[in-house]
């Protein structure tokens, strides 16, 4: 058993049929010695008396808010949560496996630039009695500071019969140099509590590997005289690291109709303009990627050909 | 503000083209190592990230773009003294810091070159003959060093009398290649920045 936060404790249980469970001793936070009784949750049934209460925790029915009283007055609370371990593996029931970039990916993180700011998000089908708390650091043995905000519900989607909820959190490395060469990864830890179930999820990454620039901005078309060709130009996104001659991007320019199966014109360039062939009912799209370290491409920025 | 983007042209900053070749060569070699050594811990997640130039050179600090010198977090240590002549500086009014930067890059390349050559000598003794260093990568390191053209003491190639542990050597190769790729990215950024300045 360990303390998650004040008056909230996590009991780690091997979860299998007829498992013996864990013996837990609760102590009432009071100078009083006599006349103390214990109850669980909203029940008025007295579980025991005395300053300490010993319980055998085997299942979720044994978890919850234990309260010690004296003469009708509440002295203190202890909330017990369960953390299940099945076949040596901690449970991951609360969050959905996003399976990208690989299986068992519960947390996904992205950074728009090298400033040390990044966003992580996760998915769940649970809508109520759910809380998250996020911590992060650079390295684990001698951790350097990363400050994370509160996790918030950022999107709701309908997937078949199920509703899916996306939560996200923003974090900022306390002293980040955009030009630095990372040797210690960022560690992100998410504590998830659903009712009386506790789970924790972690992710480890270098900022350089989670870079995904914003789409290029200000796309403009200029038809070329006596030609089917069009000059398309754009600018670096505002959120990208500066100076741009140091943090350079490369671009992919594509002309395509509405369907992905349609024919297309595609060209890659390091410049902020390109010449392509425009077709009726097609769109010109441009996306960006770090020129020197191939992490993710940005989303497309698009303008219609006409 | 979009600073001009360079294309490798002989008339331009002479080291840019070489640095682009360097990044390409080390990336290819790293990819080859990952594929060939698939049953060794050779991915970014599996290896320890070591920097053989740590406390010996200060390329990131010495080559910091002017725009980032206002960032406190970027200014850990900037007291280094290197030789200040080099052909990449040709026909330009260059600051002391730029000379310091390029000589730091030169020292990096020299250290990696020695490490890679020593390692290759060991790998050539491996009866499995599983992986060797790409001669193109070694040639590209050499070309960039020549373009930088700094005079510096020769670092003797390390020779080891004990029987090489090929497993450890291959893991060390992965560690070196990952670190060198990151440094090659920095070098490429620096050359692009200097070319645009």
């Amino acid at each position: 058993i360990w303390e998650l936060k004040k008056d909230v404790y996590v009991v780690e249980l091997d979860w299998y049929p007829d498992a013996p469970g864990e013996m837990v001793v609760l102590t009432c936070d009071t100078p009083e010695e006599d006349g103390i009784t214990w109850t669980l949750d909203q029940s008025s049934e007295v579980l025991g008396s005395g300053k300490t209460l010993t319980i055998q925790v085997k299942e979720f029915g044994d978890a919850g808010q234990y309260t010690c009283h004296k003469g009708g007055e509440v002295l203190s609370h202890s909330l017990l949560l369960l953390h299940k371990k099945e076949d040596g593996i901690w449970s991951t029931d609360i969050l959905k496996d996003q399976k990208e970039p690989k299986n068992k990916t519960f947390l996904r993180c992205e950074a728009k630039n090298y400033s040390g700011r990044f966003t992580c998000w996760w998915l769940t089908t649970i809508s109520t009695d759910l809380t998250f708390s996020v911590k992060s650091s650079r390295g684990s043995s001698d951790p350097q500071g990363v400050t994370c905000g509160a996790a918030t519900l950022s999107a709701e989607r309908v997937r078949g019969d199920n509703k899916e909820y996306e939560y996200s959190v923003e974090c900022q490395e306390d002293s980040a140099c955009p030009a630095a060469e990372e040797s210690l990864p960022i560690e992100v830890m998410v504590d998830a509590v659903h009712k009386l179930k506790y789970e924790n999820y972690t992710s480890s990454f270098f900022i350089r590997d989670i870079i995904k620039p914003d789409p290029p901005k200000n796309l403009q078309l200029k038809p070329l005289k006596n030609s089917r060709q069009v000059e398309v130009s754009w600018e670096y996104p505002d959120t990208w690291s500066t100076p741009h001659s140091y943090f350079s991007l490369t671009f992919c320019v594509q002309v395509q109709g509405k369907s992905k199966r349609e024919k297309k014109d595609r060209v890659f360039t390091d410049k902020t303009s390109a010449t392509v062939i425009c077709r009726k009912n097609a769109s010109i799209s441009v996306r960006a990627q770090d020129r020197y370290y191939s992490s993710s491409w940005s989303e497309w920025a698009s303008v219609p050909c006409s | 503000r979009n600073l001009p983007v360079a294309t490798p042209d002989p008339g331009m900053f002479p080291c840019l083209h070489h640095s682009q070749n360097l990044l390409r060569a080390v990336s290819n070699m790293l990819q080859k190592a990952r594929q060939t050594l698939e049953f060794y811990p050779c991915t970014s997640e599996e290896i320890d990230h070591e920097d053989i130039t740590k406390d010996k050179t200060s390329t990131v600090e010495a080559c910091l773009p002017l725009e980032l010198t206002k960032n406190e977090s970027c200014l850990n240590s900037r007291e280094t003294s290197f030789i200040t002549n080099g052909s990449c500086l040709a026909s330009r009014k260059t600051s002391f810091m730029m000379a310091l930067c390029l000589s730091s890059i030169y020292e990096d390349l020299k250290m990696y070159q020695v490490e890679f050559k020593t390692m290759n000598a060991k790998l050539l003794m491996d009866p499995k003959r599983q992986i060797f260093l790409d001669q193109n990568m070694l040639a590209v390191i050499d070309e960039l060093m020549q373009a930088l053209n700094f005079n510096s003491e020769t670092v003797p190639q390390k020779s080891s009398l004990e029987e090489p542990d090929f497993y450890k050597t291959k893991i060390k190769l992965c560690i070196l290649l990952h670190a060198f790729r990151i440094r090659a990215v920095t070098i490429d950024r620096v050359m692009s920045y200097l070319n645009a300045s």
């Epitope: 349609e262 024919k263 297309k264 390091d270 062939i277 077709r279 | -």
Partner: antibody, heavy 118, light 107 residues
């Protein structure tokens, strides 16, 4: 399976014209760009131009501009390349090639040898 | 027009050995570079798209690298069926242009 089948070999006199055909099978004809590339005996490849069969848009290499005409007939899934004012240096194998991507080629025809000789 | 220069023009290789063909562009073409194989009397066959993207059905011994002006096609271990002429082609701008070709011959 996608296939491009070209018309047979031709012998032409200098100053005349030649029209080579390329019939596509497999896949929808208008879903692909169609190019013509030539190869003189023992020489390399030389791009001549492309057509978008969907709308008849064409683009020609400056070297052939004014001398080459590329057309397409959607009803027969056939593209044509006509080269006029032939000279001896136009003796080559003429190949059609196609792709959903405009600027490179994934399927090629077998080639048509055009010999220009007086 | 962008001029593509291949080297060497002829490459004698022992079967089972690796081979590398170089292609250089007269100006920067990013990764807009494609490789083809042509055997005598046959049409070209696509090997690599956009400098390094492998094509389905092409053996994994063929790989491409490069960007900007310098590109390489590598055959990790030459098989008897690989003896042919190889062409690079730029797609950065029209007109599309090819290298002169490199003939890989049995040593």
């Amino acid at each position: 399976q996608v296939q491009l089948v070209q018309s047979g070999a031709e012998v032409k006199k200098p100053g005349s014209s030649v029209k080579v055909s390329c019939k596509a099978s497999g896949g929808t004809f208008s879903d692909y760009y169609l190019h013509w590339v030539r190869q003189a005996p023992g020489q390399g490849l030389e791009w001549m131009g492309w057509i978008d069969p969907e709308n008849g848009d064409t683009e020609y290499a400056p070297k052939f501009q004014g001398r080459v005409t590329i057309t397409a007939d959607e009803s027969t899934s056939t593209a044509y390349m006509e080269l006029s004012s032939l000279r001896s240096e136009d003796t080559a194998v003429y190949m059609c090639a196609r792709n959903k991507e405009l600027r490179y080629f994934d399927v090629w025809g077998q080639g048509t040898l055009v010999t220009v000789s007086s | 027009d962008i001029v593509m220069t291949q080297s060497p023009l002829s490459l004698p290789v022992t079967p089972g050995e690796p081979a590398s063909i170089s292609c250089r562009a007269s100006q920067s073409i990013s990764i807009n570079l494609h490789w083809y194989q042509q055997k005598p009397g046959q049409a070209p066959r696509q090997l690599i798209a956009f400098a390094s993207q492998s094509i389905s059905g092409v053996p994994s011994r063929f790989s491409g690298s490069g960007s900007g002006t310098d590109f390489t096609l590598t055959i990790s271990s030459l098989q008897p069926e690989d003896f042919a002429t190889y062409y690079c082609q730029q797609s950065n701008s029209f007109p599309l242009t090819f290298g002169q070709g490199t003939k890989v011959e049995i040593k």
